[in-house]
């Protein structure tokens, strides 16, 4: 339950008042307003939307709303020299060309400035050669190709299906395999759910639909030209050759109609097993090259996109705290979209807008939160989380001293089945308690709590009667706050049924068909799921900003640390002989985890019993809670990933979207049997165990009694 606050002018200004003020109809109206034209990062349209949001947030009652701008590297197709892929015959004549853009959605035929499908930050180039089909282009797919099938991708153009992992990882893997170009396509097996019509008659991807997206491997750096520092007027910028994370080979995305034309001619090796076959009527041969009759034909890419330093704009709104104005709770989500952004990001931006309006309504009635709430509309998320990262770099000193929590607010929905939450363990109890107080929007759960429907539909794999909460990975704007700065973070949205819908993301992700109508007709006609997400996100912000004692439970961190230690130990124990040979022990890590568990337990007892009317004691205990996440930060960062500094969690090195626990140890152990110098490799494992041990122990000590 929300605590009664000294800052409340009347008792009615509580969590219930805030939640009751949130209206589905407003979210619907805001979504419609935000999705009528494209809002691509770096464009005039997105600047105008930033100014509109600034103006409306001021009207809603925030204390101040500012635009902050940065000049960052963005990437666009050449307007007069379009990107495409062709099949060429032995004379070099183009006998097939892929589509230059997607067929426009119904009602949007006359909209201008729809950016054609492209892979942002692809270098220019016109490679030609034989095609190799590489499945999802995951690490394990290339292992299968190179090690088991003895297929060499060097000098070849690879074609990979979207899904399973972040597209930037696919490109990195292809580069390492020696490919000269990458074609990404959406296979119906991953982006066409059986029994559902394609857009505009359902939420499936039509054959001409294409997923846009960046293909960077930034590892948290932000703007590729100014890693570590804000891209402001006086920033030193690297040359493009030294820029962080840029791909070195041309990359281009296509839809499944065009993919059919490329894949139907494939020859060479057969696919290794059914997991390599999608749903197109093609053999899914791996190649290299085309089959007999077409063996003299090649594939040629024509990529002419340009990267240019471009101004972007964040909107930062402030609602000053009455008691602890120097403690910040941040709610942020991006505003830039690939095209209309019907789901990504505007279903999230519309929810943020309504949350701001509700907080503003309470403020106009005389209420203030205990702590300061910052609201952010980030720019250029689609180009590598640039707006959020640059702002956090500019404000890092303030954030590391004052940042209580960051709640992310990208897409509110990726389905309409149940809730999905990823967050720090510190927020588990906050999320459980909040969802127990909210009503479920799900059919068949009328009058039941959100916690109940969520638990039923997405049960925890470890604890019966509890819902699943996942680890934070990356691919969204919480990255810099959590992975770099160590600010407790969380995200929530409505999701699909992962049991029955095996496809990756939602089918129309990053396509021109992500429209208002997609949401209003097929995902959430009553906007009840949007409202629920607004209640969850807004409720979390309310509690984090308003409860006297921060709603963090350090005991939940103790539980997961033990689980993660067990997991990494079990991975290592797949090599018992080497562990013995190189004297690899996890005893110190388990000891540190045990210490953490005991200290966290004692801290929780003190937290329960201390005099909450003593402002000094209260502030001291809250600071210990706030700084616990910070204590997991290693200032040196992870190996070769200096901006991923959290020792307990990092984005997977093989899939940016996924979170990995004890990432330093995990990466040191990964594929260790193939390392040329086992002694050095196991030495690195030992080093990473010692770093993890130290970090867990040091974090535990921040919870010890101060004196």
């Amino acid at each position: 339950k929300s605590s009664s606050e000294a800052t409340n002018i009347t008792p009615k200004h509580n969590m219930k008042a805030f939640l009751d003020e949130l209206k589905a109809e407003n979210i619907k109206k805001f979504l419609h307003n935000f999705t009528q034209i494209p809002h691509l990062a770096g464009t005039e349209q997105n600047f105008q939307l930033a100014k509109q949001i600034q103006s409306q947030w001021k009207e809603f009652g925030l204390d101040s709303v500012e635009l902050t701008h940065y000049d960052v590297l963005l990437s666009y197709p050449n307007k007069t020299h379009p990107n495409y892929i062709s099949i060429i015959n032995e004379d070099g004549n183009e006998i097939f060309n892929t589509s230059l853009f997607e067929p426009p959605p119904a009602g949007y035929e006359n909209v201008s400035d729809i950016v054609p499908p492209f892979s942002a930050f692809s270098p220019q180039g016109m490679p030609e050669g034989d095609l190799v089909y590489v499945n999802y282009a995951r690490t394990e797919d290339f292992f299968k190709l190179e090690r088991d099938m003895k297929i060499n991708c060097s000098g070849k153009i690879v074609i990979a299906r979207y899904g399973k992992v972040f597209r930037g990882n696919k490109v990195k893997n292809a580069q390492l395999a020696g490919a000269t170009g990458v074609i990404l396509y959406s296979d119906p097996a991953d982006y066409f759910a059986p029994g559902v019509k394609s857009y505009p008659d359902g939420w499936n991807l039509p054959g001409g639909g294409v997923q846009r997206g960046n293909i960077l491997n930034l590892n948290g750096a932000g703007d590729p030209l100014t890693p570590g520092y804000p891209a402001n007027e006086y920033a030193y910028r690297r040359g493009i050759a030294e820029a962080v994370g840029l791909p070195s080979i041309p990359v281009h995305p296509i839809g499944y109609y065009d993919a059919q034309k490329l894949l139907e001619k494939m020859g060479g090796s057969a696919s290794p097993d059914s997991s390599w076959r999608g749903s197109l009527k093609v053999p899914y041969n791996v190649g290299p090259g085309f089959t007999g009759n077409f063996s003299t034909q090649k594939v040629k890419m024509h990529i002419h996109s340009t990267s240019e330093v471009t101004r972007i704009y964040n909107v930062i709104g402030t609602l000053r705290g009455a008691v602890e104005p120097d403690r910040y709770v941040i709610l942020g989500g991006h505003r830039d979209s690939w095209v209309f952004g019907g789901i990504d990001p505007q279903s999230g931006a519309a929810v943020v807008h309504e949350i701001v309006r509700s907080f503003g309504t309470l403020k106009k009635e005389g209420w203030r939160p205990r702590r300061t709430i910052l609201f952010a509309s980030w720019d250029a998320e689609e180009f590598g989380l640039l707006g959020s990262t640059e702002w956090a770099e500019e404000n890092s000193r303030l954030l590391q001293e004052r940042g209580v929590a960051y709640i992310n607010a990208d897409s509110s929905i990726e389905g309409n089945y149940t809730l999905r939450v990823d967050c720090t363990p510190l927020m588990y109890s906050l999320v459980y308690n909040l969802t127990k107080e909210l009503e479920s929007p799900d059919e068949g759960f009328e009058g039941k709590s959100l916690y109940e429907s969520w638990t039923k539909k997405s049960p925890s794999p470890e604890f019966s009667g509890m819902p699943r909460i996942s680890k934070l990975g990356s691919g969204n704007d919480f990255e810099v706050f959590f992975q770099r700065l160590g600010i407790a973070s969380g995200r929530a949205r409505y999701t699909k049924n992962w049991e029955t819908n095996k496809f990756s993301s939602y089918p129309l992700y990053h396509s021109v068909y992500e429209t208002y109508e997609l949401v209003e007709k097929f995902y959430d006609p009553m906007f009840k799921y949007h409202l629920t997400v607004a209640q969850v996100r807004g409720g979390m912000v309310f509690e984090l900003a308003n409860s006297v004692v921060l709603p963090f439970d350090c005991r939940d961190y103790a539980v997961v640390l033990r689980k993660y230690a067990d997991k990494i130990y079990n991975i290592s124990m797949k090599h018992p002989q080497e562990m013995k040979t190189y004297s690899v022990s996890f005893d110190s890590l388990f000891s540190a985890v045990k210490n953490f568990t005991e200290i966290a337990s004692k801290f929780s007892e003190r937290l329960r019993d201390f005099d909450k009317s003593n402002p000094i004691l209260l502030r001291m205990m809250n600071d210990q809670l706030m700084f616990l996440e910070r204590a997991f930060i290693d200032p040196l960062g992870l190996p070769d990933r200096p901006f991923y500094r959290h020792v307990i969690y990092a984005p997977s090195s093989h899939n940016k979207y996924a979170g990995e626990s004890f990432p330093g140890i995990y990466d040191a152990l990964f594929d260790i049997e193939s390392k040329v110098d086992p002694s050095q490799a196991w030495g690195e494992v030992k080093r990473q165990i010692s770093i993890a041990t130290f970090t867990v122990q040091a974090a535990a000590e921040t919870l010890s009694e101060v004196a």
């Epitope: 589509s99 853009f101 426009p104 008659d201 054959g207």
Partner: antibody, heavy 119, light 107 residues
Framework: EVKLVESEGGLVQPGSSKKLSCTAS????????MAWVRQVPEKGLEWVAS????????YYLDSLKSRFIISRDNAKNNLYLQMNSLKSEDTATYYC????????????WGQGTLVTVSA | DIQMTQSPASLSASVGEAVTITCRAS??????LAWYQQKQGKSPQLLVY???TLADGVPSRFSGSGSGTQFSLKINSLRPEDFGSYYC?????????FGGGTKLEIK
């Protein structure tokens, strides 16, 4: 065998209304988008309107949007075109046609029915 | 709206000859193009879709080609039953417009 049979056209007064119908057989009607295409005598073809599988979405030639209404009854395998405030320039043979999606060609055609708008 | 321009408007040819009809789109329609044949007093019949794929039952003397804005329909070795009118049509966006037609007559 696929069959699309339009109802009788005929002579109608300017300003009056006329409802055309088309009955389908030989295929799963609800699996197809349906459309009306017209042809002025001795002239080319002009798309008039389309309707999606279940009738929840309709699309019209802009110039006809305010006067014509396309609808369907999947239970009866029927397609309809309600034409209001008819003008002499609406005189044409009206064909009912079927396609298997929004972005698709007209795979099936009816035999057509002539509507003459004249005083 | 995308306009479709067909040429020639009319064409005389003899049985056994080969003819080509062209169609130009005012905007890029990739391969979202169909060709229809219409005989006097009859309804149109689908010949080609996706610019180059022959519809079921269409003889192989018909072939479609092109992509983007320029398309053509070729008839090799004309037969008596091939005479009539031919129309191209795009289905890239709404409205799906037709070309003005080409009337193919016996010389």
């Amino acid at each position: 065998e696929v069959k699309l049979v339009e109802s009788e056209g005929g002579l109608v007064q300017p300003g009056s209304s006329k409802k055309l119908s088309c009955t389908a057989s030989g295929f799963t009607f609800s699996d197809y988008y349906m459309a009306w295409v017209r042809q002025v005598p001795e002239k080319g073809l002009e798309w008039v309107a389309s309707i999606n599988y279940d009738g929840s979405s309709t699309y019209y030639l802009d110039s006809l949007k305010s006067r014509f209404i396309i609808s369907r009854d999947n239970a009866k395998n029927n397609l309809y075109l309600q034409m209001n405030s008819l003008k002499s320039e609406d005189t044409a043979t009206y064909y009912c046609a079927g396609s298997d999606g929004y972005w698709a060609w007209f795979a099936y055609w009816g035999q057509g029915t002539l509507v003459t708008v004249s005083a | 709206d995308i306009q479709m321009t067909q040429s020639p408007a009319s064409l005389s040819a003899s049985v056994g000859e080969a003819v080509t009809i062209t169609c130009r789109a005012s905007g890029n329609i990739h391969n979202y193009l169909a060709w229809y044949q219409q005989k006097q007093g009859k309804s149109p019949q689908l010949l080609v879709y996706n610019a180059e794929t022959l519809a079921d039952g269409v003889p192989s003397r018909f072939s479609g080609s092109g992509s983007g804005t320029q398309f053509s329909l070729k008839i090799n070795s004309l037969r008596p039953e091939d005479f009539g009118s031919y129309y191209c049509q795009h289905f890239w966006s709404t409205p799906p417009t037709f070309g003005g037609g080409t009337k193919l007559e016996i010389k």
